[in-house]
């Protein structure tokens, strides 16, 4: 629109005047005025803004606890959070990762269908008919019943979804 | 404090192309727009247009669109104003200046509160 | 466009001296002018803004006044560093066009 029927993008109303915002990693010191321009600080070691603003003080960066399971993925700048992840084998409970939770494990007759990550649990599926799991385990996919045929044996017991068939020789007295 | 400094004198032949920079310092560069003026010899102010140092987002008086692209770097502080095809009509002293805005009663009145030095472009064949 | 005419267009006038220089819009333009000195080789500089309000750093005996179409500049008592040129500006509607400027010379 012309003329301008509000401050700019990157300023704020003040006094009658519109100001320039401190821009990402610096804070606000004092207001511009009449005389002078906005005046800005940058944020400290361990503090950020991630946005243009007028906030008089920084952020902290998230502090990642190791008491909580969690760890530094990316330290933050002055213009970034620290992003905190999970220790091998555990996984965020939120996606801010406050806490960290052990990866989930597939019962027997369950196999991995996505292993976790430091952001998702494990995703287990029902093992089908032809597949197995004995374990408890967060890795192990549904493995395929053995196929006695190819070992030129014969099912002796039925595979379920929890156990593999039982293979055994072929009864020598069939003709 | 503001200072707008801009780049020295130029002499171009009709046709060829100019390129004319601005440098700020003092102030955040890229929350206030920058406005081009030019001035022929013995004339009056001519407004060609502006840009927002933000987005990089121009907008070009009418009489020079398609000849003028003004640019900007923010991570030296620093505007560009490129005026092509010149002719001899071209030959003026050249300003960047910085839009200042203003509310009262209910209104945002802007106006230009800092300006460069002027860069004299002489177009001559 | 927007036409802007000043006048006069020159004015000798004398130290001390009260010297009003005018502005005339072509249309209506509220309160959305400026006022501008310039001096030989010089930029411009920003005197008054929003047509009355008075640019910081800038002499009190400058004035600016009027809406609408019609605008006037005033130097309540004219001083040595007074004498140079004066556009007007409107910044209502693009291209934000000047007055054709007014030279303030030593009478």
């Known amino acids: 629109p012309e003329p301008p029927t509000a401050c700019r993008e990157k300023q704020y109303l003040i006094n009658s005047q519109c100001c320039s915002l401190c821009q990402p990693g610096q804070k606000l010191v004092s207001d511009c005025t009449e005389f002078t321009e906005t005046e800005c600080l940058p944020c400290g070691e361990s503090e950020f803004l991630d946005t243009w603003n007028r906030e008089t003080h920084c952020h902290q960066h998230k502090y990642c606890d190791p008491n909580l399971g969690l760890r530094v993925q990316q330290k933050g700048t002055s213009e970034t959070d620290t992003i905190c992840t999970c220790e091998e084998g555990w996984h965020c409970t939120s996606e801010a990762c406050e806490s960290c939770v052990l990866h989930r494990s597939c019962s027997p007759g369950f196999g991995v269908k996505q292993i976790a990550t430091g952001v998702s649990d494990t995703i287990c599926e029902p093992c089908p008919v032809g597949f197995f799991s004995n374990v408890s385990s967060a890795f192990e996919k549904c493995h395929p019943w053995t196929s006695c045929e190819t070992k030129d044996l014969v099912v002796q017991q039925a595979g379920t979804n929890k156990t593999d068939v039982v293979c055994g020789p072929q009864d020598r007295l069939r003709a | 404090q503001v200072q707008l400094v801009q780049s020295g004198a130029e002499v171009k032949k009709p046709g060829a192309s100019v390129k004319v920079s601005c440098k700020a310092s003092?102030?955040?560069?890229?929350?206030?727009?920058m406005y081009w003026v030019r001035q022929a010899p013995g004339q009056g102010l001519e407004w060609m247009g502006w840009?927002?140092?933000?987005?990089?987002?121009?907008t070009y008086a009418q009489k020079f669109q398609g000849r003028v692209t003004m640019t900007r770097d923010t991570s030296i502080s620093t505007a560009y104003m490129e005026l092509s095809r010149l002719r001899s009509d071209d030959t003026a002293v050249y300003y960047c200046?910085?839009?200042?805005?203003?509310?009262?009663?209910?209104?945002?009145?802007?106006?230009?509160?800092?300006w460069g030095q002027g860069t004299l472009v002489t177009v001559s064949s | 466009d927007i036409q802007l005419t000043q006048s006069p267009s020159f004015l000798s006038a004398s130290v001390g001296d009260r010297v009003t220089i005018t502005c005339r819009a072509s249309?209506?333009?509220?309160?959305?002018l400026a006022w501008y000195q310039q001096k030989p080789g010089k930029a411009p500089k920003l005197l008054i803004y929003?047509?009355?309000t008075l640019q910081s750093g800038v002499p009190s005996r400058f004035s600016g006044s009027g809406s609408g179409t019609e605008f006037t500049l005033t130097i309540s008592s004219l001083q040595p560093e007074d004498f140079a040129t004066y556009y007007c500006?409107?910044?209502?509607?693009?291209?934000?066009?000047f007055g054709q400027g007014t030279k303030v010379e030593i009478k």
């Open positions: 500006q409107q910044l209502v509607s693009y291209p934000w066009t």
């Open positions: 003092g102030y955040t560069f890229a929350g206030y727009y």
């Open positions: 200046a910085r839009e200042k805005i203003y509310y009262g009663s209910g209104n945002y009145y802007p106006s230009f509160d800092y």
């Open positions: 929003a047509a009355s």
């Open positions: 840009i927002n140092p933000d987005s990089g987002a121009p």
């Open positions: 249309q209506g333009i509220s309160s959305y």
